[in-house]
Interface confidence: low
């Protein structure tokens, strides 16, 4: 249990409040982490509060400015770059966003050895994505979808590709799936190790159907915004890898990486790409039917210039009951003889877990066991391999950084961070320097964050990094509430489940009940991290108890749990909070008739069908932004998980999953539909099907659009949407304003 | 429509220079490498270096390494081959050829220019 | 430098008949041969590139075929307008070559 102190003493009663709305909206109460810019194995750069970028230096403990902040305004520069040679930087301004990780800004080269900005060749703008090689100072650039390449910031560039085109084909950048759903980033080139080789992915959209939507914008007529988005059965991108040589480009141009051919034969994703060495790299690839993928490493062959790929060197990994890895599938972290790796993957009993592969995937090494789950490898040195999992008392919501020295046999582990700091921290992430000399560790809660500096040898604590002091003081006569986070046992099933519970909480006191669920596949949402938020002021102010449940589908407690929704969306996950209801109504403090369920995206997907469950539970909810039909959403995400809509697949289940063949059982409940017109990612096609199939039923329900918003309903939007979801639960658990 | 054309021919006297232009129409000049390429009477076809309009990076073949030069002007389209120190056996008629530049396998000189005729008599 | 052997030299064919020119390179080239075509007077025309890919605008009774260092141009039936010379090219390295060029005429 954790318990977060409400500091309620008699004598200070008086002078300490509870959570207001407005603390929330105007994130009153937010903190900070401290991730250092590793340049080497001792130095980091560090953006300081007065904006001047600095150079800390460990071992020497000096510090000095390397581009003062009058530089950094001259050109309105909110992020920098530092080339490996320490001569140039690239600043970046006019930051305009475009999906969840893709923005396009406009880049200037400061020439850190005559104070000057870099004149002539200048970078055009705006640049779609741009980075300095790993040594030196070359530099890789997307524009207009075209990929070009700058031997130095001064000269001319080199195109490297031709045949970019907007919404058609992507050189060095994903489109729109691929950025959400395979990659995760707004690149798809990488450079090696040395910078002798940049490997890049081209995506064909051409044949994809186009999403079209609204903007309004202030214009007389709309914009129309068109995205090549493949929904669940459609076309899909076509994807090929190439490389070119960036120290002779010109002389046989990039080459073609040849794709594995059990994976060619049928439609396949790219899903990522590994430097292991400047000659040799690893892709990863994955069948449209997301059980199989092939890790293929290939090498250049100086003789042809090209790249080999042999059979030898492919990695089989499959999945024989769910999809292949977890939310995606691991990627390999090589060791220092450059051919064997680690990864993660199920082992035997369905726990996801550190395996050394030397040949084959059939003889692999299981390097971690038991019934927990190893989450991220951090780093391979050439004695130690640290990584982060949730073994530690047996809290899968839980984080904590590992060390196994590889280096002598038998291989020891030991947890780094388990008991530095045990009641505030147990929720960890960690960053390193080259060769894992020092490393920085930053802690997400339960308590206060702190990011702190280790030795990389010996684990010493150097200093601490940031500790949010002004949060800590700014708490201080805040009612803050009681979190606690404990299981059900349930059929067999573990759910965990955390409660946020109002300050002066009474067990013996009735209490309204609201659920926040998002209940994804492989999500997460019973974390032991800190947090004040909307659900911290409505249990603060309001008087709310607020519970979030990790149920079937969740992740970090095994396959079983995990794939328990293969096929099924919408069906467990929905069970489960329901399940928790009953079972947090039988704890005696929780009032039956004021119980609400709100959830955003998957969430307001499970949130619309529980409120339609017919289970009479729930007297309201609200779904912001919800996925309201399988067919409605991207291939990529939607078939990992339901397979195909066709007959012969799973069309069935896509049919019965839907919101609207459940729009009658909304006539018992009170339902807030919310949803921005501009969302590019859960299209607003999915709330107006909703809202149609309401109609139809003569069903009565809420609704708020936000025009112009995305997924993420940000800005003024993100006020009103708050303030207005408050009305709504406080109208309906009869709380007066 | 796509094409090269080359200068006219011409006779030098041994050890003078000669500058053969050749200007592109029809396509995106710095799309393309430039070959150049020559062909003595009834011989063969030999290879002498490119240039990459984009950069104005150049590769000759080793033979014409220090007697060649290759420039190209992207504002008219057009690029030089210049030849130095001439000798009797560079009679020939001196082409240029475009290449792809982008993707695998170096495509092939699709596009040739006319050839220009190179007399060196004394 | 990479040299290129062609054979035969010169061969004599009538029209539709199935001629087959070979091309060696001294090492590996991959598949970074192209194949050419000359008429007297007039520039050549590149016809394969790749080893094996037609150029467009090429007949398709033109094929190429072979990687490494052994390649065969293919003309399936010789036309009037395929009298010609016939050269390799390897794009492999620097400097590029040709091969010697193979001479088809009427027999």
């Known amino acids: 249990i954790v318990l977060r102190p409400s500091r309620v003493h008699n004598s200070e009663e008086n002078t300490m409040r509870a959570l207001t709305l407005k603390d929330i909206l105007n994130g009153t109460f937010s903190y900070k982490t401290f991730f250092p810019n590793w340049i080497s194995g001792q130095e980091y750069l560090h953006q300081s509060a007065d904006n001047n970028i600095v150079l800390y230096n460990i071992e020497t403990g000096q510090s000095y400015t390397i581009l003062s902040n009058r530089t950094m305004k001259s050109v309105n520069a909110s992020n920098y770059g530092l080339s490996p040679d320490r001569q140039f930087v690239y600043l970046e301004s006019d930051y305009s966003k475009l999906w969840r990780y893709s923005y396009t800004a406009t880049y200037y080269i400061y020439d850190l050895s005559n104070g000057e900005f870099v004149r002539g060749n200048e970078l055009p703008r705006p640049i779609q994505y741009l980075c300095w090689s790993p040594v030196g100072s070359k530099l890789a650039y997307v524009y207009q979808n075209n990929i070009y390449l700058k031997q130095r910031p001064g000269d001319p560039p080199f195109q490297i590709t031709f045949n970019g085109r907007e919404n058609k084909i992507f050189n060095g950048i994903p489109d729109w799936v691929y950025e959400e759903e395979m990659l995760a980033t707004k690149y798809a080139l990488w450079w090696s190790p040395n910078g002798k080789f940049l490997a890049y992915a081209e995506f064909n959209d051409t044949d994809i159907p186009v999403i079209a939507y609204s903007y309004y914008g202030d214009e007389q007529y709309p914009r129309t915004i068109n995205i090549p988005y493949p929904k669940a059965g459609a076309k899909n991108p076509v994807v090929r890898i190439f490389i070119i040589d960036t120290t002779y480009p010109a002389y046989v141009g990039p080459q073609e990486v040849p794709v594995p051919a059990m994976i060619a034969s049928s439609d396949y994703y790219f899903s990522w790409l590994t430097w292991v060495t400047d000659e040799r790299v690893c892709l990863q690839w994955l069948k449209r039917v997301q059980n199989v993928s092939v890790l293929s490493i290939c090498d250049f062959r100086e003789d042809w210039q090209t790249w080999d790929c042999p059979k030898t060197q492919e990695h089989i990994e499959e999945s024989r009951t769910g999809w292949a890895g977890g939310f995606f599938v691991s990627t390999p972290v090589f060791s220092y003889d450059a051919i064997s790796y680690y990864k993660i993957f199920s082992d035997k009993d369905g726990y996801k877990h550190i395996h050394y592969i030397k040949d084959t995937v059939e003889n692999a090494i299981q390097i971690t066991s038991g019934k927990w789950e190893a989450i991220n490898i951090f780093r391979v040195t050439q004695d130690s391999l640290f990584y982060s999992s949730n073994e530690f008392e047996e809290y899968p919501g839980r984080r904590n950084i590992y060390r196994i020295s590889i280096g002598s046999y038998p291989p020891s582990k030991k947890c780094v961070t388990c008991h530095l700091r045990k009641e505030r921290c147990q929720y960890y992430t960690a960053s390193f320097s080259d060769y894992a000399k020092y490393y920085a560790l930053v802690c997400y809660g339960p308590g206060i964050p702190i990011s702190t500096l280790h030795d990389g040898r010996t684990d010493q604590e150097i200093k601490i990094l940031e500790e949010n002091k002004e949060l800590e003081n700014a708490l201080k006569n805040i009612q803050l509430p009681k979190e606690e986070i404990k299981k059900l046992e349930v059929d067999e099933i573990t759910l965990w489940y955390k409660m946020i519970l109002p300050p002066q909480f009474d067990r013996s006191k009735k209490y309204p009940l609201l659920i926040q669920v998002y209940g994804g596949p492989c999500s997460q949402s019973v974390r032991s991290v800190f947090a004040v938020n909307w659900i911290s002021y409505l249990a603060s102010k309001e008087g709310m108890v607020i519970a979030l449940v990790d149920g079937r589908g969740t992740a970090f407690q095994g396959d079983k749990l995990l794939y328990a929704v293969y096929r099924k969306l919408g069906v467990y996950e929905v069970e489960d909070q329901i399940t928790a209801v009953r079972k947090f109504i039988e704890m005696g403090f929780i009032d039956e008739k004021r119980i609400a369920i709100w959830g955003w995206s998957y969430g307001g997907y499970v949130s619309s069908l529980a409120l339609a469950s017919g289970t009479g539970l729930f007297k309201c909810g609200i779904a912001v932004a919800p996925v309201s039909s399988w067919e409605y959403y991207a291939s990529v995400y939607t078939e990992r998980f339901m397979g195909l809509p066709t007959k012969d697949d799973n069309l069935e289940h896509y049919k019965n999953s839907t919101v609207m063949a459940r729009a009658e059982y909304f006539r018992n409940v009170d339902y807030l539909l919310i949803h921005g017109t501009a969302d590019d990612n859960v299209h607003f096609q999915n709330s107006a099907q909703i809202a149609k199939a309401l109609v139809n039923a003569q069903v009565d329900f809420q609704a708020m659009w936000y025009s112009d918003q995305n997924h993420g309903l940000s800005g003024l939007s993100t006020n009103h949407l708050y303030t207005h979801m408050t009305h709504f639960l406080k109208q309906c658990f009869s709380l007066s304003d | 429509q796509v094409q090269l054309v080359q200068s006219g021919a011409e006779v030098k006297k041994p050890g003078a220079s000669v500058k053969v232009s050749c200007k592109a129409s029809?396509?995106?000049?710095?799309?393309?490498?430039m070959n150049w390429v020559r062909q003595a009477p009834g011989q063969g076809l030999e290879w002498m270096g490119w240039i990459n309009p984009q950069s104005g990076d150049v590769n000759f073949a080793q033979k014409f390494q220090g007697r060649v030069t290759m420039t190209r002007d992207t504002s008219i389209s057009t690029a030089y081959m210049e030849l130095s120190r001439l000798r009797s056996d560079d009679t020939a008629v001196y082409y240029c050829?475009?290449?792809?530049?982008?993707?695998?396998?170096?495509?092939?000189?699709?596009?040739w220019g006319q050839g220009t005729t190179v007399t060196v008599s004394s | 430098d990479i040299q290129m052997t062609q054979s035969p030299s010169s061969l004599s064919a009538s029209v539709g008949d199935r001629v087959t020119i070979t091309c060696r390179a001294s090492q590996n080239i991959g598949s970074y041969l192209n194949w050419y075509q000359q008429k007297p007077g007039k520039a050549p025309k590149l016809l394969i590139y790749?080893?094996?890919s037609l150029q467009s605008g090429v007949p398709s009774r033109f094929s190429g075929s072979g990687s490494g260092t052994d390649f065969t141009l293919t003309i399936s039936s010789l036309q009037p307008e395929d009298f010609a010379t016939y050269y390799c090219q390897q794009a492999n390295s620097f400097p590029f070559t040709f091969g010697p060029g193979t001479k088809v005429d009427i027999k």
């Open positions: 050829a475009r290449q792809f530049r982008g993707y695998s396998y170096g495509y092939g000189m699709d596009v």
């Open positions: 790749a080893a094996s």
């Open positions: 029809g396509y995106t000049f710095t799309g393309y490498y």
